[in-house]
Interface confidence: medium
């Protein structure tokens, strides 16, 4: 599955768990494999393109979410979601996904 599809579906599911179920643990269980995939690096041109387009922002979001794990300051998680939100919008618009 293409990275943008995995991230699109993953962010939707993470959003459902966090905003709907208030399940932070479940949210991390969805997002961390996606971040690990990004960290391993691209292996195709499409993955390289995704990494260049969204990699920096997603890494920043990840840093905020990891900071939340140690700080327990909800505002750190807010900052992560702010970034995930913008990336999700861009992926949605760029790849013409339908909800």
């Amino acid at each position: 599955i293409l990275w943008h599809e995995q991230w699109h579906e993953g962010l939707e599911e993470a959003s459902r768990l966090y905003f709907g179920d208030r399940n932070v643990k479940g949210m991390f269980e969805i997002l961390e494999p996606l971040h690990a995939m990004l960290e391993r690096g691209p292996q195709t041109l499409k993955e390289t393109s995704f990494s260049q387009a969204y990699g920096r922002e997603l890494t920043e979001a990840y840093e905020w979410s990891q900071r939340y794990k140690t700080s327990a300051v909800v505002m750190d998680l807010d900052r992560a979601w702010d970034i995930y939100y913008h990336v999700f919008q861009k992926i949605s618009r760029h790849h013409h996904h339908h909800h």
Partner: antibody
């Protein structure tokens, strides 16, 4: 067509109990999130409680915690609000609403609301 | 709890006027803010979600914007059916909280 229909409101004495129902139709109730919101006469909106129909996960406002219980029966496509130890300040119109997210966004809002049911707590 | 401070609490305007209602969150809520319209004796109706996205079927004269923790609902040209009470609401933190409402009345 999405519909939410509340019932079960009425007049009850302080300390009494009521169970409100919210019958849902026109959408996949099993994977949905239902919230109760109330509005005291002449006042603004106050969030009361929420439930995830699939996981059973619940949240409550501090003002009702320990007195109100939200539940859902997926076989009947119905959410409930069991209200115990009622007080005069619980007098309000109670609305149930569906909590949803949308294309292009990760954030959620209450997109469909029932017509409301009036609960009056008075001796 | 997050406070959503809405202003003004009421305003008088004429048909055709541009109307702006603001809501300030007491802390970061990202873009997780919705706006609702409520008419007397009726349930609220969703107008705007995610701070600036227009809900399906809502006229384009309604728009929303965000600047940090400040959120704005704008009605570009007020119509007779727009006289109602408007509420903002944040959905990023529980308890979910609403603004106190803005009643838009006919001048």
């Amino acid at each position: 067509e999405v519909q939410l229909v509340e019932s079960g409101g009425g007049l009850v004495q302080p300390g009494g109990s009521l169970r409100l129902s919210c019958a849902a139709s026109g959408f996949n109730f099993y994977s949905s999130y239902i919230h109760w919101v109330r509005q005291a006469p002449g006042k603004g909106l106050e969030w009361v409680a929420s439930i995830s129909s699939s996981s059973g996960s619940t949240s409550y406002a501090d003002s009702v915690k320990g007195r109100f219980t939200i539940s859902a029966d997926t076989s009947k496509n119905t959410a409930y609000l069991q209200m115990n130890s009622l007080r005069a300040e619980d007098t309000a119109v109670y609305y149930c609403a569906r909590f949803s997210s949308y294309y292009y966004t990760l954030y959620w809002a209450m997109d469909y609301w029932g017509q409301g049911t009036l609960v009056t707590v008075s001796s | 709890d997050i406070q959503m401070t809405q202003s003004p609490s009421s305003l008088s305007a004429s048909v055709g006027d541009r109307v702006t209602i603001t809501c300030r969150a007491s802390q970061s809520v990202s873009s997780a803010v919705a706006w609702y319209q409520q008419k007397p004796g009726k349930a609220p109706k969703l107008l705007i979600y995610s701070a600036s996205s227009l809900y399906s079927g809502v006229p384009s004269r309604f728009s929303g914007s965000r600047s940090g923790t400040d959120f704005t609902l704008t009605i570009s040209s007020l119509q007779p059916e727009d006289f109602a009470t408007y509420y903002c609401q944040q959905s990023i933190h529980y308890p979910l909280t609403f603004g106190q409402g803005t009643k838009v009345e006919i001048k």
